[in-house]
């Protein structure tokens, strides 16, 4: 039985060049958190194993930073890393739980962070 | 080359014990999470155990807790599947498998299989 | 416990046919779905994950989609090779769970 849910920053936006944290918050559940995968559209960005530790996908490791917590950092951000985002949770014993967080980039100073949100 | 070779199967009485042995080779034993998969006579397959890469956690489907034990040796390259309180529903090939690091419950890679009778 | 229904259980085509094997999971999985192919007397080998990726080293005549509760995967101009029993898996909830698998014989 899943009962948990998945927080997240929800819709956010960031400055070209700058650095953004992507958040995910796992509650109201006891299941033990064994992974965290941190993926844009279908690719792999980052994992959090709870025995390994980080890995950064070979591709992403100069503009990706693990942390805070279970969080991932984007740094140098350009335009193109603008799109959505996914925490995957992997726990036992509940299973798969997917947070989404929609990143803007922008080319001006106007970035603003948006709601929190909930996903069950 | 992936290579999973499992031993230790045999014909067992109901309620009797038997130790199940995978030695690994061809990959970093100590980063995957490895599993065992039994196929039925009938040629179902059914998961039952995963240990985590560092042995940390260990997860099973309830038709088999509190009688099956999966640990591992990282030193020695191999995977355990002690089995105790056999039953006839238990009967099946064994199949060891390494699971894909980025997706826990994906089994990339299975080996030969070793086989379990449990008859009177 | 999810339960994976695969359709049909067998399957009979020929050669150069396209074929769909169908896999229903009883709540909804999301994209979390492996589809494993088993030759006769072989062991099982992993072909497709998160419902539409292929494996490394699987021929592209194979393909694999859906979410939620539907999934599908497809074999383009079948060869005498994918003569074979499939299993899809779904990977979003404990206890991890297995269709009862789709033979295809060749006409």
């Known amino acids: 039985m899943m009962t948990g849910t998945i927080e997240t920053t929800g819709n956010i936006s960031a400055e070209k060049g700058g650095s953004i944290i992507l958040q995910c918050h796992l509650s109201s559940t006891t299941a033990q958190v064994t992974q965290v995968n941190w993926e844009q559209q279908d690719q792999l960005l980052a994992i959090c194993n709870a025995d390994l530790g980080w890995h950064i996908s070979p591709s992403f490791k100069d503009r990706v930073a693990p942390g805070p917590g279970l969080g991932l950092t984007l740094q140098s951000l350009t335009v193109n890393d603008t799109g959505e985002y996914f925490c995957i949770y992997h726990t036992y014993p509940d299973g798969t739980y997917t947070g989404r967080i929609f990143l803007e980039v922008l080319e001006s100073s106007v970035a603003e962070h948006g709601a929190r949100f909930q996903i069950p | 080359e992936v290579k999973l070779v499992e031993s230790g199967g045999g014909l067992v009485k109901p309620g009797g014990s038997l130790k199940l042995s995978c030695a690994a080779s061809g990959f970093d034993f100590s980063r995957y999470d490895m599993s065992w998969v039994r196929q039925t006579p009938e040629k179902r397959l059914e998961w039952a155990a995963t240990?985590?890469?560092?042995?940390?956690?260990?997860y099973q489907p309830d038709s088999v807790k509190g009688r099956f034990t999966i640990s591992r040796d990282n030193a020695r390259n191999t995977l355990y599947l002690q089995m105790s309180s056999l039953r006839s529903e238990d009967t099946a090939l064994y199949y060891c498998?390494?699971?894909?690091?980025?997706?826990?419950?994906?089994?990339?890679?299975w080996g030969q299989g070793t086989s379990v009778t449990v008859s009177s | 416990d999810i339960q994976m229904n695969q359709s049909p259980s067998s399957l009979s085509a020929s050669l150069g046919d396209t074929i769909t094997i169908t896999c229903h999971a009883s709540?909804?999985?999301?994209?979390?779905l492996s589809w494993y192919q088993q030759k006769p007397g072989n062991i099982p080998k992993l072909l497709i994950y998160?419902?539409?990726n292929l494996h490394t080293g699987v021929p592209s005549r194979f393909s694999g989609s859906g979410s939620g509760t539907g999934f599908t995967l497809t074999i383009s101009s079948l060869q005498p090779e994918d003569i074979a029993t499939y299993y899809c898996?779904?990977?979003?909830?404990?206890?991890?769970?297995f269709g009862g698998g789709t033979t295809l014989e060749i006409k």
């Open positions: 898996q779904q990977g979003q909830s404990y206890p991890w769970t």
């Open positions: 998160k419902a539409s």
């Open positions: 498998a390494r699971q894909d690091y980025r997706y826990p419950y994906i089994m990339d890679y």
């Open positions: 240990i985590s890469s560092g042995g940390s956690y260990t």
């Open positions: 709540q909804n999985i999301n994209v979390w």
